[in-house]
Interface confidence: low
């Protein structure tokens, strides 16, 4: 399907005469009849097999014909055809004189013909206009013509139908040669197949629209390349779905039993060395200058109470500095300018003169110490913390820092081993003198009831079409991971072939 376009450009009839030589009165009011037909070696009268078209009166005698295409006018003249363009044609253009307004052939006198031209030849489809000029003894006609394809038709002879679409049946535009050009994100013969997100796993992922990646059962992640481990798997991984392979240092069915607290939690601070001492139990060996269960407390140089005579110690970047009370001086406030007359003994201490009054000594009441009875006796001296707890002086009180497994103000209480619910799958926990014991429900065994003894749901090979079967341990059921091209809970249904193209 296409259009033969004829653009009349200029008609010259300087003398204003008819083909018979008779002049027009008052001038030749000229219109044209065009006949387009199949190729004839000698163009002869007969049916205009490709179509006909007539113009209104375009001018008198000699005139140029205005390009009226943009305004929807009649120049170029349009001769549509609904067949494959054969590449050859015959064209007859007649110029007629219209004495009146009726331009029908039967309404015109037979000698109203001004001129007639007939051409034939080859013409390929294309945008280029072929310019031609035909001259007779009295007239000259300049015109150009071309053949172009109708909308949605393409190819060298306008025989290729292609209509862009973006729906269920295809997502494409048409190339200049009529072939399909898929819209971004689509592929396939008719551009019906979406291109999944780049990197989407071929077997484990699929998509229903471009740049999507939907995961098949048992797979996850942006590209569906990560298997989903067993439900409840804490510190384990999988290489196929529903596995739970424990990371190093973890044990149990769900890999939730910590066998390496040091590595997993790094509890020891400030460069201390950590040693595992049982499940969730550890010991920190502190570097010099640090203390505390986790070596989290920095041993200040002031902790050794270097300032004497009631001096206050202030930490510095490197070392400490003593702020001395009145009457004392020196690096540690060790030098005194006082005597008993200055009442230097605090907290009810008694002053005794020495060296003929040049010096003194304080005798302190119970719970106080120091050269001026200025210090309370260290509350940690008696080590009140039980079970290896560490005593810390903190402000006006003391505090016991307990080792793992103990609690209470003085670390006197033993934490139950069963408090952590260590028995899996509903096992019953019993505290013993040296640890614990699990009583397992039916179907489970092992020290922590972590071993499953029930049947394997995949044993009966329930999956079709070479699908992979996985057992869901928590429900005793199976899951089939279908290969590409199959769906269904057992992968029993082939994916439907794409529907035939609707043209």
């Amino acid at each position: 399907s296409g259009v033969f376009q004829l653009q009349l450009q200029e008609f010259i009839n300087e003398r204003g005469v008819l083909a018979s030589g008779r002049p027009c009165e008052p001038g030749c009011r000229t219109f044209f009849r065009v006949c387009l037909k199949h190729f004839q070696a000698v163009v002869s009268p007969g049916p205009c097999t490709f179509g006909t078209v007539s113009t209104p009166v375009l001018g008198t005698n000699s005139f140029a014909v205005r390009d009226d295409s943009s305004g929807g006018g009649r120049n170029p003249l349009q001769l549509p055809f609904n067949f494959t363009w054969p590449g050859t044609f015959s064209l007859i253009i007649e110029a007629w004189h219209a004495p009146g307004d009726d331009l029908r052939p039967e309404a015109l006198p037979p000698d109203a013909l001004i001129s007639k031209i007939a051409i034939q030849g080859s013409l390929a489809v294309g945008q280029n206009w072929l310019l031609d000029e035909q001259t007779s003894t009295l007239t000259r006609l300049r015109y150009s013509y071309r053949v172009i394809c109708s909308d949605n038709y393409y190819g060298d002879n306008c025989s290729r139908l292609c209509k862009k679409r973006n729906d269920h049946f295809g997502h494409y535009v048409c190339q200049p040669d009529g072939n399909l050009s898929c819209l971004p994100g689509w592929t396939g013969e008719y551009c019906q197949q979406p291109i999944c997100l780049s990197g989407c796993h071929e077997q484990n992922g699929y998509c229903s629209k471009p740049a999507e990646c939907l995961c098949r059962p048992g797979w996850q992640g942006r590209l569906c390349n990560e298997c989903i481990p067993h439900n409840g798997c804490r510190h384990g991984t999988c290489s196929t779905p529903w596995q739970c392979t424990c990371d190093e240092g973890w044990g149990g069915l769900f890999c939730d039993q910590d066998l390496n607290y040091c590595t997993h939690h790094s509890p020891c601070k400030n460069g201390a060395t950590c040693s595992n001492s049982g499940q969730r139990s550890y010991t920190c060996t502190c570097r010099p200058g640090y203390t505390g269960v986790d070596c989290e407390l920095e041993l200040s140089e002031c902790d050794s109470n270097p300032c004497r005579n009631g001096g206050s110690c202030k930490d510095q970047e490197d070392g400490y500095h003593c702020l001395c009370p009145p009457g004392y001086y020196g690096l540690h406030c060790e030098h005194s300018t006082l005597s008993c007359a200055d009442s230097p003994c605090f907290n009810g201490g008694s002053c005794r003169e020495r060296n003929q009054g040049a010096n003194y000594a304080c005798e302190c009441p119970p719970n106080f110490t120091g050269s001026n009875c200025e210090k309370k006796v260290d509350r940690c001296t008696s080590n009140p913390c039980a079970n290896g707890g560490q005593c810390l002086n903190r402000g006006p009180s003391r505090m016991c820092r307990c080792r793992p497994g103990f609690t209470g103000t003085y670390c006197e209480l033993h934490v139950s081993d069963c408090a952590r619910n260590p028995c899996a799958h509903g096992g019953t926990c019993h505290d013993l003198e040296n640890g614990l014991m699990c009583t397992c429900p039916a179907g489970f065994s092992g020290r922590r009831c972590e071993v499953r003894t029930s049947i394997d749901a995949c044993a009966s090979s329930p999956c079709f079409n070479r699908a992979t079967c996985y057992t869901d341990l928590s429900t005793d059921t199976f899951v089939c991971n279908c290969p590409y091209g199959f769906v269904g809970s057992r992968c029993e249904f082939p994916v439907g072939l794409p529907p035939s193209f609707p043209w």
């Epitope: 943009s70 294309g126 280029n128 535009v173 048409c174 190339q175 200049p176 040669d177 072939n179 050009s181």
Partner: antibody, heavy 122, light 108 residues
Framework: QVQLVQSGAEVKKPGASVKVSCKAS????????MHWVRQAPGQGLEWMGI????????SYAQKFQGRVTMTRDTSTSTVYMELSSLRSEDTAVYYC???????????????WGQGTLVTVSS | EIVLTQSPATLSLSPGERATLSCRAS??????LAWYQQKPGQAPRLLIY???NRATGIPARFSGSGSGTDFTLTISSLEPEDFAVYYC??????????FGQGTKVEIK
């Protein structure tokens, strides 16, 4: 990515012909129309013509009709523009430009060659 | 053929200022108009197509408007790299594809 690489600069005498090539890569060669646009020194852009690489059909600006010939070689994904009867006013940079295709046949030029300087001098 | 007339021929502005370039068509081109930027020694670069759509990778400071016969390219705040020659081009009525004569945006 789409690339259009043109042949090197040419110096020609008046009356001679010049043939400039434009090699396309990074896309399906036959799926996009190719245009030629020229630019005289210090002047604006002037459209010369278009070629359909699929069938080899062309359309030329009226000004160049009879002097310009655009061809293509699908085996090498190359289009050619030959301009004959050169005169001094044909001294210009000649660009090939790929037409961006959509449902309408005439679109814009997103991808251009680097340009080929043709100097016409006696 | 459709003639595109650009104004002004030269626009002298400082970085940070707003640039407004005009393109007028001799007859309606609907919204089928594009804008290109060209720097010395380089091929043109497509900025705007179909009057108001930014081409891939073009910064948001470039915007186009208009339809029919009157079109405008606006650069909201000139960057140093925006000083160049700008051409409009129509695809409404072809052949030929026609370009405007260009507007040079220079540093004041």
């Amino acid at each position: 990515q789409v690339q259009l690489v043109q042949s090197g600069a040419e110096v020609k005498k008046p009356g001679a012909s010049v043939k400039v090539s434009c090699k396309a890569s990074g896309y399906t060669f036959t799926s996009y129309y190719m245009h030629w646009v020229r630019q005289a020194p210090g002047q604006g852009l002037e459209w010369m013509g278009i070629i359909n690489p699929s069938g080899g059909s062309t359309s030329y600006a009226q000004k160049f009709q009879g002097r310009v010939t655009m061809t293509r070689d699908t085996s090498t994904s190359t289009v050619y523009m030959e301009l004959s009867s050169l005169r001094s006013e044909d001294t210009a940079v000649y660009y090939c430009a790929r037409e961006e295709y959509s449902s309408r046949s005439a679109e814009y030029f997103q991808h251009w060659g680097q340009g080929t300087l043709v100097t016409v001098s006696s | 053929e459709i003639v595109l007339t650009q104004s002004p021929a030269t626009l002298s502005l400082s970085p940070g200022e707003r640039a407004t370039l005009s393109c007028r068509a001799s007859q309606s081109v609907s919204s089928y108009l594009a804008w290109y930027q060209q720097k010395p020694g380089q091929a043109p670069r497509l900025l705007i197509y179909d009057a108001s759509n930014r081409a891939t990778g073009i910064p948001a400071r470039f915007s186009g408007s208009g339809s029919g016969t009157d079109f405008t390219l606006t650069i909201s705040s000139l960057e140093p790299e925006d000083f160049a020659v700008y051409y409009c081009q129509q695809r409404s009525n072809w052949p030929p594809w026609t370009f405007g004569q260009g507007t040079k945006v220079e540093i004041k």
